[in-house]
């Protein structure tokens, strides 16, 4: 749902839940283009690009939260890859020098439908949570109540250092969407119901 | 009400520098990005930077990132423009406005009357 | 970078009469159902001031002549029966990347 615009048909929203998830846990649509971009596509550097611990929920934190209380780490977690991903995108090389290089645009243009992706993904959590009838959460179109700050490592002007960080952030935030995927798998399919 | 008021402008000759401030009240700043945006002497708007509501982001117009820095100290309810190295084509009216709308793809809602920047020998 | 391309430079429109002013992207500021797009008044001596937000969404107190419309690169503000006080210059924004980027503006005036 775009726009703010709210379904409130439960399994529609599931679903659509499900599917965005699906695809933002593809490696295919951001680390691997961010790689190749940046110049790490070397096994010596690939290994250097790990998830740093802490910076995402793990499953098992997410699996004990309940529905609510899922949605609303989700949404907060969300806000804040939006603002790291607005971070990478300012440092990535234009198009222009793509091509110069010849690198693949169709990279970066998959690493530009990120953020507007995150941002169908949070819509979509606002509205399951108003579904849930949860109204803690803030509306994604209105400023919040001041979003809480990513556990970002301390800005660097070390350029290596910076593709290195965001390489990882990237990492995590796939996984990230993979556990979450996972605990939408186990939604019943009404409002109050779970599968175990 | 709210409201933003600009100061800090002046005459500066080239390669100079000037610290632009901007004073908030009547809304939550530390809740809000904000940006600085200009206008040249009878042309048009031109985004300059913009800060997220904790600090931790900024995002710079290429051709001031490096010269240019925007913070902001949220205990003070205040936004900064730190110019060095000023040039002539720096020569502007510089507004101070609120972010708001979805996350990183946001709009102006509010603007100050802005404070005008002259660059000159 | 984006870039916004207003037309008409200029607009001299009868009181009463509709006003249409026309802006394009160097390429889409639409994606994932959002459209990226916004328009403000500037009227002499003052701020620009916000009348469409995401290319269709009017601002609370602005009047409802003002509509936009418009996704992809093609958006366009329409003033259904121009003002006196509607006398301004109009600009486009798009926020779908950094760095944001205005259109060059478009003076409205009364035939």
């Known amino acids: 749902a775009a726009m703010g615009s709210c379904s409130k048909e439960y399994r529609m929203l599931l679903g659509q839940l499900q599917k965005q998830t699906d695809l933002m846990q593809d490696t295919s649509r951001l680390l691997d283009p961010y790689i190749r971009i940046q110049g790490l596509d070397i096994p010596k550097l690939r290994e250097h690009c790990r998830e740093s611990p802490g910076a995402f929920p793990s499953e098992e934190t997410l699996r004990g939260l309940g529905r609510r209380g899922f949605l609303q780490t989700l949404n907060a977690t969300l806000g804040r890859v939006l603002h790291r991903l607005a971070d990478l995108e300012q440092h990535l090389p234009k198009a222009q020098d793509l091509e110069r290089s010849g690198l693949n645009i169709e990279d970066l243009e998959k690493l530009q439908m990120a953020r507007p992706n995150v941002l169908g993904l949070r819509n979509n959590v606002y509205c399951m949570a108003q579904l849930l009838d949860n109204s803690d959460m803030t509306e994604p179109t209105k400023a919040g109540r001041g979003t809480p700050q990513p556990p970002t490592p301390t800005p660097t002007s070390d350029v290596f250092q910076r593709k290195l960080e965001g390489c990882s952030f990237l990492r995590g935030y796939h996984r990230f969407m993979h556990s979450v995927g996972r605990v939408f798998s186990k939604w019943g399919e009404s409002p109050n119901r779970s599968r175990r | 009400e709210v409201q933003l008021v600009e100061s800090g402008g002046g005459l500066v000759q080239p390669g100079g520098s000037l610290r632009l401030s901007c004073a908030a009240s009547?809304?939550?700043?530390?809740?809000?990005?904000m940006s600085w945006v200009r206008q040249a002497p009878g042309k048009g708007l031109e985004w300059v930077a913009t800060?997220?509501?904790?600090?931790?982001?900024?995002y710079y117009l290429d051709n001031v990132r490096g010269r240019f820095t925007i913070s902001r100290d949220n205990a003070k309810n205040s936004l900064y423009l730190q110019m060095n190295s000023l040039r002539a084509e720096d020569t502007a009216v510089y507004y101070c406005?609120?972010?708001?709308?979805?996350?990183?793809?946001?709009?102006?809602?509010?603007w100050g009357r802005g404070t005008l920047v002259t660059v000159s020998s | 970078d984006i870039v916004m391309t207003q037309s008409p430079d200029s607009l001299a429109v009868s009181l009463g009469e509709r006003a249409t002013i026309n802006c394009r992207a160097s390429?889409?500021?639409?994606?994932?159902?959002?459209?990226?797009m916004h328009w403000y008044q500037q009227k002499p001596g003052q701020p620009p001031k916000v009348l469409i937000y995401?290319?269709?969404n009017l601002e609370s107190g602005v009047p409802d002549r003002f509509s936009g419309s418009g996704s992809g690169t093609d958006f366009t503000l329409t003033i259904s029966s121009l003002q006196a006080e509607d006398v301004a210059v109009y600009y486009c924004l798009h926020s779908r990347e950094f760095p944001f980027t205005f259109g060059g503006g478009t003076k409205v005036e009364i035939k």
């Open positions: 406005a609120r972010d708001v709308g979805h996350t990183t793809f946001w709009y102006f809602d509010v």
């Open positions: 800060i997220s509501d904790g600090g931790s982001f900024t």
């Open positions: 995401y290319a269709s």
């Open positions: 390429k889409s500021v639409s994606a994932a159902g959002y459209n990226f």
């Open positions: 009547g809304f939550t700043f530390s809740s809000y990005w």
